[in-house]
Interface confidence: medium
């Protein structure tokens, strides 16, 4: 299950991965030294019945339909880290791998 | 981040894990031999700003607020498998570990 990739010109209404560049300078996040911006991507779109479901569980909850379950939503199903240079809480400048920064794939869960 | 656990009597409105027993017999899924039912759990509730976010990315997308991003939703952030005995598509009886069957933790992503 590779997920769908879209862009701002796509007519796709279903769950899809879209490009997004996050700009730390624009946020005023001056504790991040590098990168100043990076390609993060994001997930958006509708989760139709059985479409792009990562887990069997998603379908089972749809079948069971318990109180308060809102149905699956379009969310990251595969993410990757990036290397960053940043101030830690001791005000040391650290080079480190930060997990969960890039969306590689979107799906319904 | 251990997530929240709730039950049907809880007044919690935020993203939480609720108990759910999936009953394969009730679904009429006769190709599943065992278990006939199991504790699957599910996720439900609101994702307030910065609450229970699994990934830094979730907060970054909220900051960037791109077109069509619906905000984070309450979804499984940790899942586990169960062992099952079932008929496969060749009508062989298989004993296997099926991933993504139990919600261990819920969060906002």
């Amino acid at each position: 299950n590779l997920g769908l990739d879209c862009d701002e010109h796509s007519s796709e209404s279903r769950c899809c991965r879209y490009p997004l560049t996050v700009d730390f300078e624009a946020f005023g996040w001056d504790w991040i030294i590098a990168p100043k911006r990076y390609k993060a991507n994001y997930c958006s779109g509708q989760c139709e019945y059985m479409f792009m479901q990562k887990y069997p569980h998603t379908h089972l909850v749809q079948q069971a339909n318990p109180r308060g379950s809102a149905g699956p939503c379009c969310t990251p199903t595969k993410m990757s880290p990036i290397n960053m240079l940043y101030f830690n809480d001791k005000q040391q400048i650290i080079y480190g791998k930060i997990p969960g920064m890039v969306v590689d794939r979107c799906g319904c869960s | 981040n251990l997530g929240l656990d709730c039950d049907e009597h809880s007044s919690e409105s935020r993203c939480c894990r609720y108990p759910l027993t999936v009953d394969f017999e009730a679904f009429g899924w006769d190709w599943i031999i065992a278990p006939k039912r199991y504790k699957a759990n599910y996720c439900s509730g609101q994702c307030e700003y910065m609450f229970m976010q699994k990934y830094p990315h979730t907060h970054l997308v909220q900051q960037a607020n791109p077109r069509g991003s619906a905000g984070p939703c309450c979804t499984p952030t940790k899942m586990s498998p169960i062992n099952m005995l079932y008929f496969n598509d060749k009508q062989q009886i298989i004993y296997g570990k099926i991933p993504g069957m139990v919600v261990d933790r819920c969060g906002c992503s």
Partner: antibody, heavy 125, light 107 residues
């Protein structure tokens, strides 16, 4: 291909300020993936990182030199400069400028590549 | 600041020899280490990044290994052009710090 060319005097008197510039060619100093640094090497010794700057003017200095160092960027001239005040004989060294490259995918970083040709600075009266 | 202790400070070897240089960090730096070669009167050139990844264009006789606090650079078969000074660089915590260098001379 980015190249760095250094300019500055080879002799500085004690207690004066050492000034060097590094001109960037083959690329923009304002590229958001580039950071610009200075390193020095005293005679017969190892390398010492002095500091690094970003085109917006944000700078990071080696604490051992911080009180005496200023690194600045002139985007209009596509160059950056080093000023080291109150120099002594201990500041005699070959001074290098260099680029750090940070890929916006976040996967690939390249420290100190390329380098300038080096400037030998002697502190002596 | 993290101290980088490089050994030996110098060594004599012949063409074809296998040579290993080590670098020890005063604290854990994961694999955030590079190796540089410097020839007299020239700027250093990066050989290895991320402790063990070979820089594009660098001959495969150069290899790096290690993580945490112990690192090594190995030249599997020394060539005439490899006689130079080698430095390690840690880029885990500012200030970046270099080893004091190992001079590889012709025996």
């Amino acid at each position: 291909e980015v190249q760095l060319v250094q300019l500055g005097p080879g002799l500085v008197k004690p207690s004066e300020t050492l000034s060097l510039t590094c001109t960037v060619s083959g690329g923009s100093i304002s590229n958001s993936n580039y950071y610009w640094g200075w390193i020095r090497q005293p005679p017969g010794k190892g390398l010492e990182w002095i500091g690094t700057t970003y085109y917006s003017g944000t700078t990071y200095y080696n604490p051992s030199l911080k009180s005496r160092v200023t690194i600045s960027v002139d985007t209009s001239k596509n160059q950056f400069s080093l000023k080291l005040s109150s120099v002594t004989a201990a500041d005699t060294a070959v001074y290098y400028c260099a680029r750090d490259y940070y890929d916006s995918s976040g996967y690939y970083y390249n420290w100190f590549d390329p380098w300038g040709q080096g400037t030998t600075v002697t502190v002596s009266s | 600041a993290i101290q980088m202790t490089q050994s030996p400070s110098s060594l004599s070897a012949s063409v074809g020899d296998r040579v290993t240089i080590t670098c020890r960090a005063s604290q854990d730096i994961r694999n955030d280490l590079g190796w540089y070669q410097q020839k007299p009167g020239k700027a250093p050139k990066r050989l290895i990044y991320a402790a063990s990844s070979l820089q594009s264009g660098v001959p495969s006789r150069f290899s790096g290994s290690g993580s945490g606090t112990e690192f090594s650079l190995t030249l599997s078969s020394l060539q005439p052009e490899d006689f130079a000074t080698y430095f390690c660089l840690q880029h885990h915590i500012y200030p970046w710090t270099f080893g004091q260098g190992t001079k590889v001379e012709i025996k």
